[in-house]
């Protein structure tokens, strides 16, 4: 194929690939009709003047994962057709001025994963057609004003994984076509007002893993097309009331790993397209009414690993499309019976690792599509009669690591678990905590003939029970179950019963990655 160097492979499609540690210089002669050239994993340390002079038809040039530390300014001369240039994963510390001069067709320039210490306006002044510029994974400490002023067609700019401590409010002002801006994993402590005002077409803004403490109230007000906003793992302690007010297209917002203490009603929205909201690993202590009410299309709400001890009954108002709600690893002791009433489409709720002592009988009354409930590691001693009976799609229920009180009142829960086991997978069985003589024994094989009578009257469910059984299509009113009768009846039925005998001590620990944050 018009002469292929011995160190390379050349294909019919004018593609040349040169790889291997034995290569220490750009191989020659390269086929004059080459359109794609890849020089990968070699020991080339420098590019001298015009090594590609005779392959002017080249469209894509990848020089990646080499030892490249020095480039002569004229290295890319005569590559006027070049559209894609990658120098990623090398050891470049300095870019010579004029290096990209003459690359009039260049659309993608990848300089990521080098050791670049600075960039200057003159570096990219000739790259007027550039659409993608990758500078992530370098050692940049600041971006001078004007660095990107000539890149008016740029749609993607990645400055992540550098050492940026501040950003000039003017540095992005001419990038009106930018769709993706990534500034993640830097050392930014604040972002000046107006920094993003010129980015009217921005769709993704990645600011995660910085040290941002405050967000200016109008920081995103000009970014009406923003779809993805990543603010996780910063030091944000409060959200200005209007900070998210002008983001009607937003469908992904991450705020996990910050220092948020409270969420004020209406802080989110209106965001009619937001599908996921990640708020885990903050310091939130309560959720007021209507805090998420603008998020009509929200499907995933992650509030785990906070310090939530109180949830107002109307906190989840408006979340009619929510599928997954994660509240695990908080400080919840009680839940209002109506708190989940609006979540008609909820499929997965994680409440594990809280301090829940009891659940209202109607807590899941309107959430008929629930498929998974995680209640492990709370302070539950029993559950109200019929609490799961209407949940015909339930296929995962985790109840282990609670201090179950195995007196006669536990029988309905024990029966439900036994009769529904094929729907509940093979997870860990709940274990009795009291009375003391049965501590550590499996709840579902207690000897019911010697069950301890209860010494209290449990809470009576506040809703009529219509247990879910696949073979029973409906129940006439005359046979509906009244929970009051058996729960408040005296204990004479148990006069011959003294203690619970349980002989099974097996415990299998099971975890899923669902709701792990």
């Amino acid at each position: 194929y018009h002469g292929c160097p011995s160190e390379c492979t050349c294909s019919r499609a004018s593609q040349v690939e040169c790889t291997g540690a034995r290569i220490v210089a750009v191989p020659t002669p390269l086929p004059w009709n080459a359109m794609s050239l890849q020089i990968l994993n070699t020991h080339i340390t420098e590019l001298n003047e015009s090594p590609f002079l005779n392959i002017s038809a080249l469209i894509a040039l990848r020089i990646e994962k080499n030892e490249l530390s020095r480039i002569t300014p004229g290295a890319f001369r005569n590559l006027g057709s070049l559209r894609y240039l990658s120098l990623a994963n090398n050891k470049l510390q300095v870019l010579p001025i004029g290096l990209f001069q003459g690359l009039d067709s260049l659309e993608s320039l990848l300089l990521s994963s080098n050791q670049l210490l600075q960039i200057q306006p003159a570096h990219f002044s000739q790259c007027s057609n550039l659409k993608e510029l990758q500078l992530h994974g370098n050692h940049l400490e600041y971006i001078p004003d004007g660095a990107f002023d000539h890149l008016v067609g740029l749609t993607k700019l990645n400055l992540g994984k550098n050492s940026l401590t501040h950003i000039s409010p003017r540095v992005f002002q001419h990038l009106g076509n930018l769709q993706v801006l990534r500034l993640y994993e830097n050392r930014l402590t604040d972002i000046p007002m107006g920094t993003f005002d010129g980015l009217v077409n921005l769709q993704e803004l990645a600011l995660q893993q910085n040290q941002i403490g405050l967000l200016s109230p109008g920081l995103f007000h000009n970014n009406h097309n923003l779809q993805r906003l990543y603010l996780s793992n910063n030091h944000i302690s409060q959200l200005p009331p209007s900070v998210f007010m002008q983001l009607p297209q937003l469908n992904r917002l991450t705020l996990f790993g910050n220092s948020l203490k409270e969420l004020s009603p209406g802080i989110f929205g209106p965001m009619p397209n937001l599908r996921e909201l990640w708020l885990y690993d903050n310091h939130i202590s309560s959720l007021p009414d209507n805090v998420f009410s603008n998020l009509r299309q929200l499907q995933v709400l992650i509030l785990s690993r906070n310090q939530i001890s109180f949830i107002s009954p109307g906190a989840f108002n408006g979340l009619t499309e929510l599928r997954e709600l994660s509240l695990h690893t908080n400080a919840l002791q009680d839940l209002d019976g109506n708190v989940f009433r609006m979540l008609a489409n909820l499929q997965n709720i994680s409440l594990q690792n809280n301090r829940l002592r009891q659940l209202p009988g109607n807590i899941f009354a309107n959430v008929n599509g629930l498929m998974a409930i995680q209640l492990q590691n709370n302070q539950l001693e029993n559950l109200p009669l019929g609490i799961f009976d209407h949940l015909g799609k339930l296929c995962e229920l985790r109840l282990y690591d609670n201090p179950w009180r195995c007196d006669s009142d536990i029988l309905p829960l024990r029966n439900w678990l036994l009769l529904n086991q094929p729907r509940l997978g093979t997870d860990t069985v709940p274990v009795c905590f009291s009375p003391a003589n049965v501590r550590g024994q499996s709840l579902i094989i207690i000897n019911v003939n010697v069950a301890v009578p209860s010494v209290h009257v449990p809470e009576v469910p506040s809703y009529p029970e219509t247990p879910w059984y696949p073979d029973t299509p409906s129940y006439p009113d005359t046979t509906s179950v009244s929970s009051t009768t058996e729960l408040t009846s005296p204990v004479e039925d148990y006069t011959d019963l003294t203690t619970i005998q349980v002989t099974d001590d097996r415990s299998v620990w099971g975890m899923t990655q669902a709701q792990s944050g």
Epitope: N415, T472, S489
Partner: antibody
Framework: QVQLVQSGAEVKKPGASVKVSCKAS????????IHWVRQAPGQGLEWMGY??????KYNERFRGRATLTSDKSTSTVYMELSSLRSEDTAVYYC????????WGQGTLVTVSS | DIVMTQSPDSLAVSLGERATINCRAS??????????MNWYQQKPGQPPKLLIY???NQGSGVPDRFSGSGSGTDFTLTISSLQAEDVAVYYC?????????FGGGTKVEIK
């Protein structure tokens, strides 16, 4: 003392229905499942279904022919089997709890023309 | 349906000797780390009586000479020292999933 007392023997013609009762005492009626099991003469045991708090579950072999009901006021469970045929001749037992820990004395149903 | 196969069909054992009855399920009857295998004793003209539930747990009032073992698909009922009153038919049963199914029975007699 837990007891399950069943109704007396029945003789039925093919195509007819039979309704067997099982009266429970000595425990909280609503806290336990009641199963029905039958045993043809000289044969093994066959589970028919259970009832618990008005909810029922049936063996597919009996679905549509067997109906389980209960009357909480009298702590009584009923098993009705319709469209009887000669092979339904058997002793029918009720049994308490998931683990069948107490059984009724059995009711012989004879189907003969 | 889960099919339960008992062996042997009948067993003659001397008084005071050990009697062992096996039961195999067509698929595992384990859940939650517990085996949902139960054993019943039926004497002529009487209803069955629960001996062992969940593979190894004795029913109320069952003598200590009756024990159960096994997991997964293979289970054993052992009568450590056969007594005259143990002459009966013994049934295994799985309660892992509906329909709950019984083995065909093993008749135990005195040799």
């Amino acid at each position: 003392q837990v007891q399950l007392v069943q109704s007396g023997a029945e003789v039925k013609k093919p195509g007819a229905s039979v309704k067997v009762s099982c009266k429970a005492s000595g425990y909280t009626f609503t806290s336990f499942v009641i199963h029905w099991v039958r045993q043809a003469p000289g044969q093994g045991l066959e589970w028919m279904g259970y009832i618990y708090n008005q909810g029922t579950k049936y063996n597919e072999r009996f679905r549509g022919r067997a109906t389980l009901t209960s009357d909480k006021s009298t702590s009584t469970v009923y098993m009705e089997l319709s469209s009887l045929r000669s092979e339904d001749t058997a002793v029918y037992y009720c049994a308490r709890d998931y683990y069948f820990d107490y059984w009724g004395q059995g009711t012989l149903v004879t189907v003969s023309s | 349906d889960i099919v339960m196969t008992q062996s042997p069909d009948s067993l003659a054992v001397s008084l005071g000797e050990r009697a062992t009855i096996n039961c195999r399920a067509s698929e595992s009857v384990d859940y939650y780390g517990i085996s949902f295998m139960n054993w019943y004793q039926q004497k002529p003209g009487q209803p069955p009586k629960l001996l062992i539930y969940a593979a190894s747990n004795q029913g109320s009032g069952v003598p200590d000479r009756f024990s159960g073992s096994g997991s997964g698909t293979d289970f054993t009922l052992t009568i450590s020292s056969l007594q005259a009153e143990d002459v009966a038919v013994y049934y295994c049963q799985q309660s892992k999933e509906v329909p709950y199914t019984f083995g065909g029975g093993t008749k135990v007699e005195i040799k």
